[in-house]
């Protein structure tokens, strides 16, 4: 708390300008009218206030707006945003994408802070869904943003927003998240032709079911091994050797290097050794010739 003291004669601030950087903390408290500060917040960021001085300015705004700042003030907080706590931010009603961008810019280059996470949460909740423009903005500042959302939160992403997603935005997504995103991507890109469709859908294939992988294998897509290794194991297991060969095209040779890793290892164990041998890659571990394969899951379903 800054002690209340009278403003010295002649020091009452008439405008928010550079002269204020020479004011001591108590002088700022005594001589700067909070309403003047609020109407001239857009000028604060151009003035090199110290962190201590910014504390005083924040205190003044808190007193003026105990229920939370209006958006015009929020939009021009600049470095003062770094002084805000998540509790402060929860009082805000941020509806403008310009405001969001302005505050994300302040935090640019840093990890997502609790303040930024709270701001984004308030913004997205206020909008009701993660629209394309918002997603564009958030992933531009935080490429890993999408993968920080829970599957429940991702369910509010409309398919149209998927166009904003870049491959690197999905790098840290787990299978549960891709399970939610894949159907949206499939819907978003459904009107594209084969090769263009595959380029767009590729990053989302970690959520694809077996039948979609089978369909892709008929389209000469030449999936690379990195993408194949990210596929759901349960989606890969039912694929035949022929289907995997068609799916990977010239990249099929890469299976040898990955034969000890999932999903390749588990897939090999489900294939007849005869079929694996047709690939000419020396893959071992398939079902020996003459053995009968019982699909117990199917048997349980029938009984």
């Amino acid at each position: 708390e800054v002690e209340k003291t009278a403003c010295p004669s002649g020091k009452k601030a008439r405008e928010i300008d550079e002269s204020l950087i020479f004011y001591k903390k108590w002088e700022l408290e005594a001589c700067v009218d909070a309403a003047l500060l609020a109407t001239q917040m857009d000028r604060v960021n151009a003035i090199p206030f110290t962190y201590e001085q910014l504390d005083v300015l924040k205190h003044k705004l808190d007193e003026l707006y105990p229920q939370g700042y209006p958006e015009s003030v929020i939009q021009h907080l600049g470095y003062l945003f770094l002084k805000m706590s998540p509790e402060d931010i929860r009082k805000w009603n941020v509806t403008s994408l310009e405001t969001l961008k302005a505050l994300l810019e302040v935090n640019k280059g840093h990890e997502m802070s609790p303040q930024v996470a709270t701001l984004i949460d308030r913004f997205v909740k206020g909008r009701g869904q993660l629209d394309k423009d918002t997603l564009d903005t958030l992933t531009a500042f935080y490429p890993g943003y999408l993968c920080s959302l829970s599957p429940e939160e991702l369910s509010s992403v409309p398919p149209s927003s998927i166009w904003a997603v870049r491959p690197q935005d999905l790098d840290t997504c787990d299978p549960r998240q891709l399970d939610v995103l894949y159907p949206k991507a499939r819907l978003a890109f459904q009107n594209m032709n084969g090769s263009e469709y595959f380029v767009k859908i590729q990053s989302f294939l970690g959520g694809a079911p077996t039948e979609d992988l089978k369909a892709l294998s008929q389209q000469n897509v030449s999936m690379d091994l990195a993408t194949f290794m990210k596929l759901r194991t349960d989606a890969v297991l039912p694929l035949t050797v022929a289907e995997v060969q068609k799916l990977l095209g010239p990249h099929v040779e890469g299976l040898k290097a990955e034969e000890r890793h999932r999903p390749v290892r588990d897939w090999i164990l489900r294939q007849r050794q005869d079929d694996l041998d047709t690939l000419g890659l020396g893959l071992q571990g398939g079902i020996p010739n003459g053995y009968l394969v019982l699909d117990l899951s199917m048997q349980e379903a029938l009984s």
């Epitope: 309403a35 609020a38 109407t39 857009d42 000028r43 960021n45 151009a46 209006p70 003030v73």
Partner: nanobody
Framework: EVQLVESGGGLVQPGGSLRLSCAAS????????MGWFRQAPGKGRELVAS????????YYPDSVEGRFTISRDNAKRMVYLQMNSLRAEDTAVYYC???????????WGQGTQVTVSS
Amino acid sequence: EVQLVESGGGLVQPGGSLRLSCAASGSTSNYYAMGWFRQAPGKGRELVASINSFDSITYYPDSVEGRFTISRDNAKRMVYLQMNSLRAEDTAVYYCAARKKGLAFSYWGQGTQVTVSS
């Protein structure tokens, strides 16, 4: 370039009221804020009221708080200053002003004289 033209000044008795008007040649919404300043003889120019264009947040110094009210009409490109309970110390030339985002008030009208005297 914006042009600001004030009107409504004059002679008024203490305790009386006046309404100043400011007509802007360009749209007032092009400016981050519009304001009224005054300058009494031998004194510096003083901001007495300002209003932000896009959300109507207002500011008044203690000397006029509760007595002066600033308002705007974007459609008519007008800014007003309603002055009530006028005092002798409110005597000054009153200037309409505008500013762009991040900048000081830098667009000024020619001023209108307000004299409070019995």
